[in-house]
């Protein structure tokens, strides 16, 4: 059995300004039990996008049930999309933990490129 | 404190139904995955059965996959298994076990990984 | 599956070392349950891989490595004597066990 990947497909996506953006990101097992956030940009000053934990995250849906219990398929759309909205988002597993769920595998990450809006 | 009481054993006959019962206090179930262990006379550990802390997401063990079902009362603070067709290798000790992990979303499926609370036990003995 | 000695022995004051072998390095996080009798009530020493749970003496320890977990009692009491069982889960099953250690303290 081996252990959990993040899988990206998608290297980069295009979007037009006020169109929505679907990121997609799948995950090869359902251990280790733990939260799956997005983030644009790495390191420490990313922004964090999505997190299925806890939050309000009024742009973004997911494009799967995540009540499923064997669902693996933690993409999201994000709406309205602005030229501010470009960048590489990456979909970030972490593992429960005590006190803190811990950081645990990252998909590659998605460039999200802002094409103009069509006049 | 967080205790878990289980009730609801005793002698059964093969073939019928039991329903076994554990109440839980000092957490939420809601917040938790709970799941049965049982051990038979003289062996080891086994899983039966477990919920999520999302009420739905519930797993059984092939043993007694489509003759048991777990369900949850959050208002009572309750956990059942439903064991139906019983049969003389479902006697032994049955446990109630507590997942250490808070959940509050879907992710957690119904893993008992970290568990970190037991039952005392109810006895079970399925003879005719 | 998870593979652990079927018993061990130690004099009062030693350390204890209990292994568990996962077949797989997805076993992601491993507990240690003490019952002192059969049928009575398993008492979780480890959980976590490697934390203790309030009430259980700093005695008890625990570590995880890859696919191995191991139990570790530091100045073991007579009281210890008992089964361990190792816990985990993987991908299709929520809870496994280990068949359980024998923990004997001799004199």
């Known amino acids: 059995e081996d252990e959990l990947q993040v899988i990206q497909p998608e290297k980069s996506v295009s979007v037009a300004a006020g169109e929505s953006a679907t990121l997609r990101c799948a995950m090869t097992s359902l251990i280790p039990v733990g939260p799956i956030m997005w983030f644009r940009g790495a390191g420490a000053g990313r922004e964090l996008i999505y997190n299925q934990k806890e939050g309000h995250f009024p742009r973004v849906t997911t494009v799967s049930e995540l009540t499923k219990r064997n669902n693996l398929d933690f993409s999201i759309s994000i709406s309205n999309i602005t030229p501010a909205d470009a960048g590489t988002y990456y979909c970030v597993k972490f593992r429960k933990g005590s006190p803190d769920d811990v950081e645990f595998k990252s998909g590659a990450g998605t460039e999200l490129s802002v094409r103009a809006k069509p006049s | 404190a967080v205790t878990l009481d289980e009730s609801g054993g005793g002698l059964q006959t093969p073939g019928r139904a039991l329903s076994l019962v554990c109440r839980g206090s000092?957490?939420?179930?809601?917040?938790?995955?709970m799941g049965w262990v049982r051990q038979a006379p003289g062996k080891g550990l086994e899983f039966i059965a477990s919920?999520?802390?999302?009420?739905?997401?519930?797993h059984y063990a092939p043993a007694v996959k489509g003759r048991a079902t777990i369900t949850r009362d959050v208002g009572q603070s309750t956990v059942r298994l439903q064991l139906n067709n019983l049969r003389a290798e479902d006697t032994g000790t049955y446990f109630c076990?507590?997942?250490?992990?808070?959940?509050?979303?879907?992710?957690?499926?119904?893993?008992?990984?970290?568990?970190?609370?037991w039952g005392h036990g109810t006895e079970v003995i399925v003879s005719s | 599956a998870l593979t652990q000695p079927s018993s061990v022995s130690a004099n009062p004051g030693e350390t204890v070392k209990i292994t568990c072998s996962g077949d797989?390095?997805?076993?992601?996080?491993y507990g240690w349950y003490q019952q002192k009798s059969p049928g009575s009530a398993p008492v979780t020493v480890i959980?976590?891989?490697?934390k203790r749970p309030s009430g259980i003496p700093s005695r008890f320890s625990g570590s995880a490595s890859g696919s191995t977990a191991t139990l570790i009692i530091t100045g073991v009491q007579v009281e210890d004597e008992a089964v361990y069982f190792c816990?985990?889960?993987?991908?299709?099953?929520?809870?496994?066990f280990g068949a359980g250690t024998t923990l004997t303290v001799l004199g």
């Open positions: 959980y976590y891989n490697d």
């Open positions: 000092g957490f939420s179930i809601s917040s938790y995955n």
């Open positions: 076990a507590k997942d250490a992990y808070q959940c509050s979303y879907a992710t957690c499926n119904d893993y008992l990984d970290t568990i970190d609370a």
């Open positions: 919920i999520g802390s999302d009420g739905s997401s519930t």
């Open positions: 797989n390095s997805a076993h992601y996080y």
């Open positions: 816990g985990s889960a993987d991908s299709s099953n929520p809870a496994i």
